[in-house]
């Protein structure tokens, strides 16, 4: 019985959009058929859910509609993708994954990806 | 403030059943999976159950698993231990605790006694 | 399962004095994956560190913990009058839930 490992990359640039993605992959040491993924924002020590999904093996990540996360799976490896970021936003971002079926539970957290988002510069009146 | 009140415990012969409850307050209920653990007389903790979410996927300790029901109602942001065929081995305190975003058992309530005795 | 085994039972020491308790796991437990916790007679358990070594939102700077694989470590660097209760540590990474029988810091 291993614990399951969780790998993120460390750093991530969001895009003038505020649309940051990465890619959340986890060792799994059983054969799960229910996994829930979440997104957790670190800061100041403070711990908060940005979104959560729960998915079936083989079958696509669906989060709620008014999330602001977006995902698909293959195997064991999930692409996430944040939008609507802003520089205040920028900060660590955990994964953790928990295998929820069948038994036994297992829970997965990554060390983080530290986002930075940059709010793109305001366009300069242009006279004509 | 998070705050989670347990209730429902007493004394109770063996064989019969009992429903405990746990009111949670202060955070968004259905974000976070909520364990029963129990404390006989002068032992250790012992992990009972815990449910996940919404309130499909739970998990028993061998000692209760087919005696024990978990559930919770996420709308009334309630928790619930439902327990049959009680023996004098269960004659505990029952905490209900938050399970936090980083897995550990962040919050707990006040604990309430159950005692199983003819 | 993954049996914990704390030592000591019980440990004497006098206020100001370090503690030093031990969580012995029987199998290797990822370091992100056990905490400690405090228990004062009477009370419920109250969680001190999780992942090891990160203190919970208002514990002091006092209490610390280590370690990795199989052993674990809970310090208090100088023990204040309410630090004298019993502690418990946990292991969360996998079910079911485990947690150690207990160390109890007495007064000596």
């Known amino acids: 019985c291993k614990a399951m490992h969780v790998a993120q990359p460390a750093v991530v640039l969001a895009s003038s959009r505020g649309i940051a993605s990465f890619v959340c992959e986890y060792a799994s040491p059983g054969k799960a058929t229910e996994v829930r993924v979440t997104v957790l924002r670190q800061a100041d020590s403070q711990v908060t859910e940005v979104c959560a999904a729960t998915y079936m093996m083989g079958n696509e990540l669906t989060f709620l509609d008014d999330s602001i996360c977006t995902g698909t799976s293959s195997g064991n490896q999930v692409n996430l993708t944040i939008q609507g970021l802003r520089a205040m936003d920028t900060g660590l971002y955990i994964c953790k994954v928990e295998l929820m079926y069948p038994p036994p539970y297992y829970l997965g957290i990554g060390n983080g990806t530290q986002i930075y988002v940059i709010d793109p510069e305001p366009c300069p009146d242009s006279d004509f | 403030q998070v705050q989670l009140v347990e209730s429902g415990g007493g004394v109770v012969q063996p064989g019969r059943s009992l429903r405990l409850s746990c009111a949670a307050s202060?955070?968004?209920?259905?974000?976070?999976?909520i364990h029963w653990v129990r404390q006989a007389p002068g032992k250790g903790l012992e992990w009972v159950a815990v449910?996940?979410?919404?309130?499909?996927?739970?998990h028993y300790a061998d000692s209760v698993e087919g005696r024990f029901t978990i559930t919770r109602d996420n709308s009334n942001n309630t928790l619930y231990l439902q327990m049959n065929s009680l023996r004098a081995e269960d004659t505990a305190v029952y905490y209900c605790a938050r399970q936090g975003y980083m897995g550990s058992l962040d919050y707990w309530g006040q604990g309430i006694l159950v005692t199983v005795s003819s | 399962e993954i049996v914990l085994t704390q030592s000591p039972g019980t440990l004497s020491l006098s206020p100001g004095e370090r503690a030093t308790l031990s969580c012995r796991a029987s199998?290797?437990?990822?370091?992100?994956?056990l905490a400690w916790y405090q228990q004062r007679p009477g009370q419920a358990p109250r969680l001190l560190i999780y992942?090891?070594?990160s203190r919970a939102t208002g514990i002091p700077d006092r209490f610390s913990g280590s370690g990795s694989g199989t052993d674990f470590t809970l310090t208090i660097s100088r023990l204040e009058p309410e630090d004298f209760a019993v502690y418990y540590c946990q292991q969360y990474g996998r079910s079911p839930w485990t947690f150690g029988q207990g160390t109890k810091v007495e007064i000596k």
């Open positions: 199998q290797s437990v990822s370091s992100s994956y």
């Open positions: 449910i996940w979410y919404d309130g499909r996927n739970k």
């Open positions: 992942g090891a070594s």
């Open positions: 202060g955070f968004t209920f259905s974000n976070f999976g």
